[in-house]
Interface confidence: low
C-alpha cells in the first residue's frame, strides 16, 4: 500500500480580521495509526494550535468528526481571527508510539494572511497658531492594518496636496502595520473655514476610504488691520475717534486707547461681526474732550491679538483749530519688533 501523504491543498488563505479561517488537511491513508496535530511555524519553536488527542483549544473546531475510525479529513476552523494569527500552519501526522507518539509526516503548510482594517486616521496639527503664508505641518496616523499595502492622500478643501512624507512601519514582516504621514500646508487668509483631510485606502475597506480631518480654524491666526478715523464733531469741544479692527481671527483681542501715550481705556472685543471668510471685525470709539487739552493730542489705538505683541495705529488730533472734518491717519506703528532673522 502507498505510504500516507498529508495534503494541505491551499498554499495560502486570506481572512479578514474577526472572521473564521478554514485550514484544510487530508491524509491519503488510515495507516499508520496515530493522531493529527496542527502547528504554526516549523522547527523547535513552533506553536501548537490543535492536538487531536488531548488539550483544550477553544478557538479551534474540526470540520469532520475525528472520532470516526475511517476519517481522513483533518481540516480545522479557527474563529475570531486577529492579525496576530498570521503565519504558516502545518498539519502533522503522528505515529502511535510508546511512551510518546512520533512525528511521521507533515503537510506542505498553509500560509494564513489576515486582512485587518486600519484604524480611523487621526490628524493632528501644530501646537501653536501661525499666520498666513507660513507653512505648518500636519500629521496623520493609522494603525493595526494588514496586509502592508496602503495608500494615503492629503487634501486641503478637496484639493490634493503633494508636499508630504509617509512611512509604513515596521519595514519587515509583521502581523500588522502602522502608517505615519506628515504634510506641509501653506496657510492663506481664507483658511479659517478650511479643512485638511487625510484619506487612507486599504484592501479591507472595499473602496470606501477612511478619513481624518483637522480644521485650520484651530491652526490659523489672522492678524488684524487697524484704521483710526476722526468722526465729525458731535458736540462743542467733543470729538469722536473710532478704531476699526478688521479681518482678525481668533476672536481673542484686547484694545487700549492712549492719549499722548497715557492709557485712557482698555476693552475686550465682545460684540464682533463675522465676515464671510470666518474672520471678525470690531470697532471701538473714544470721545475726546478737546477743551481739556491745550496742545495737539496724539491718539493711539493699540491692539493685542491672541497674545501676540501689540500693534498700534495713531491719529493726530489738532487742538488749535477745532476739527470739523475727518483727519488723516499716520502710518501704522508696530510696537513689537517686526524683523525676523533666522541665523
Amino acid at each position: 500500500e502507498e505510504e500516507l501523504q498529508v495534503i494541505q491543498p491551499d498554499k495560502s488563505v486570506l481572512v479578514a480580521a474577526g472572521e473564521t479561517a478554514t485550514l484544510r488537511c487530508t491524509a491519503t491513508s488510515l495507516i499508520p495509526v496515530g493522531p493529527i496535530q496542527w502547528f504554526r511555524g516549523a522547527g523547535p519553536g513552533r506553536e501548537l494550535i490543535y492536538n487531536q488527542k488531548e488539550g483544550h483549544f477553544p478557538r479551534v473546531t474540526t470540520v469532520s468528526d475525528l472520532t470516526k475510525r475511517n476519517n481522513m479529513d483533518f481540516s480545522i476552523r479557527i474563529g475570531n481571527i486577529t492579525p496576530a494569527d498570521a503565519g504558516t500552519y502545518y498539519c502533522v501526522k503522528f505515529r502511535k508510539g510508546s511512551p510518546d507518539d512520533v512525528e511521521f509526516k507533515s503537510g506542505a503548510g498553509t500560509e494564513l494572511s489576515v486582512r485587518a482594517k486600519p484604524s480611523a486616521p487621526v490628524v493632528s496639527g501644530p501646537a501653536a497658531r501661525a499666520t498666513p503664508q507660513h507653512t505648518v505641518s500636519f500629521t496623520c496616523e493609522s494603525h493595526g492594518f494588514s496586509p502592508r499595502d496602503i495608500t494615503l492622500k492629503w487634501f486641503k478643501n478637496g484639493n490634493e496636496l503633494s508636499d508630504f512624507q509617509t512611512n509604513v512601519d515596521p519595514v519587515g514582516e509583521s502581523v500588522s502595520y502602522s502608517i505615519h504621514s506628515t504634510a506641509k500646508v501653506v496657510l492663506t487668509r481664507e483658511d479659517v473655514h478650511s479643512q485638511v483631510i487625510c484619506e487612507v485606502a486599504h484592501v479591507t475597506l472595499q473602496g470606501d476610504p477612511l478619513r481624518g480631518t483637522a480644521n485650520l480654524s484651530e491652526t490659523i491666526r489672522v492678524p488684524p488691520t487697524l484704521e483710526v478715523t476722526q468722526q465729525p464733531v458731535r458736540a462743542e469741544n467733543q470729538v469722536n475717534v473710532t478704531c476699526q479692527v478688521r479681518k482678525f481671527y481668533p476672536q481673542r483681542l484686547q484694545l487700549t486707547w492712549l492719549e499722548n501715550g497715557n492709557v485712557s481705556r482698555t476693552e475686550t472685543a465682545s460684540t464682533v461681526t463675522e465676515n464671510k471668510d470666518g474672520t471678525y471685525n470690531w470697532m471701538s470709539w473714544l470721545l475726546v474732550n478737546v477743551s481739556a487739552h491745550r496742545d495737539d493730542v496724539k491718539l493711539t489705538c493699540q491692539v493685542e491679538h491672541d497674545g501676540q505683541p501689540a500693534v498700534s495705529k495713531s491719529h493726530d488730533l489738532k487742538v488749535s483749530a477745532h476739527p470739523k472734518e475727518q483727519g488723516s491717519n499716520t502710518a501704522a506703528e508696530n510696537t513689537g519688533s517686526n524683523e525676523r532673522n533666522i541665523y
Epitope: A130, P132, Q133, K184
Partner: antibody
Framework: QIQLVQSGSELKKPGASVKVSCRAR????????MNWVRQAPGQGLEWMGF????????TYAQGFKGRFVFSLDTSVSTAYLQIGSLKAEDTAVYYC????????????????WGQGTLVTVSS | DIQMTQSPSSLSASVGDRVTITCRAS??????LAWYQQKPGKAPKSLIY???YRYIGVPSRFSGSGSGTDFTLTISSLQPEDFATYFC????????TFDQGTKLEIK
Amino acid sequence: QIQLVQSGSELKKPGASVKVSCRARGYTLTDYAMNWVRQAPGQGLEWMGFINTYTGEPTYAQGFKGRFVFSLDTSVSTAYLQIGSLKAEDTAVYYCARTRGYYDFDGGAFDYWGQGTLVTVSS
Amino acid sequence: DIQMTQSPSSLSASVGDRVTITCRASQNVGTHLAWYQQKPGKAPKSLIYSAIYRYIGVPSRFSGSGSGTDFTLTISSLQPEDFATYFCQQYNTYPLTFDQGTKLEIK
C-alpha cells in the same frame, strides 16, 4: 497671466542708495511671499531672503543684513528692495521671485520670477 | 550652509539627445529640491519642485528624480530651445542655496 515686473537698470556711485521695485500682476501680492535673489556678473544665484507679504515681516540671509531692506506697498501691489551705502561688489542683477509661502524650517521653491534689475555701482 | 554641487559644470549635446544632469546636496534635503533653467540675459525659469513635480506648462520631456542627497534632471529628447544653464536649489534648510549651474551647449 501672472507676472512680476521689475524696475529698470540703475547706475549708481559708491555710497549712494538704490531702490528696486517688483510689481505683482495677475494675483494678489499679499497671498504669496516674495524672495530676492542676486546674480553677480557671470556668477550663480544667491538667495538674499524674503518678505512675508501678509505681515510685512522680512527675513534676511546672513550676508544681507544691515544695508539691505525689504519693504512693501500693498496699495500698488509692489515689493521693494533697498540697498544703502552701495559698493562696487553690489553690482549684480537683482531678481524678485515668488514662492507660495515659506517654511519655518524648509524654505520654498520659486514659481515665478521678475525679469531682473541690473544695478551697476561705479565711480 | 548646505552646499549644492552639480555635475557636469558644462555639457555638449545634440538635438534629440537624452541628457542627464545630477545635483548633490552636502546633507539630506528630503525632496525639497527645485530645478531652474536660465538663458543668457534672461531671468531663471522654474521647471521642477519637490524633486519630481513639473510646473504647469513645462514640457514632459523634463523630469526630475531623487531624494535625500542625490538628484537628477533628465531631458529625454533635447530641443533647440533647451540649450541653457540649469540650476538646482535646495529649500530644506535656511539659507536657501543654489548650485553653480550646468551649462548645456550645442555640440
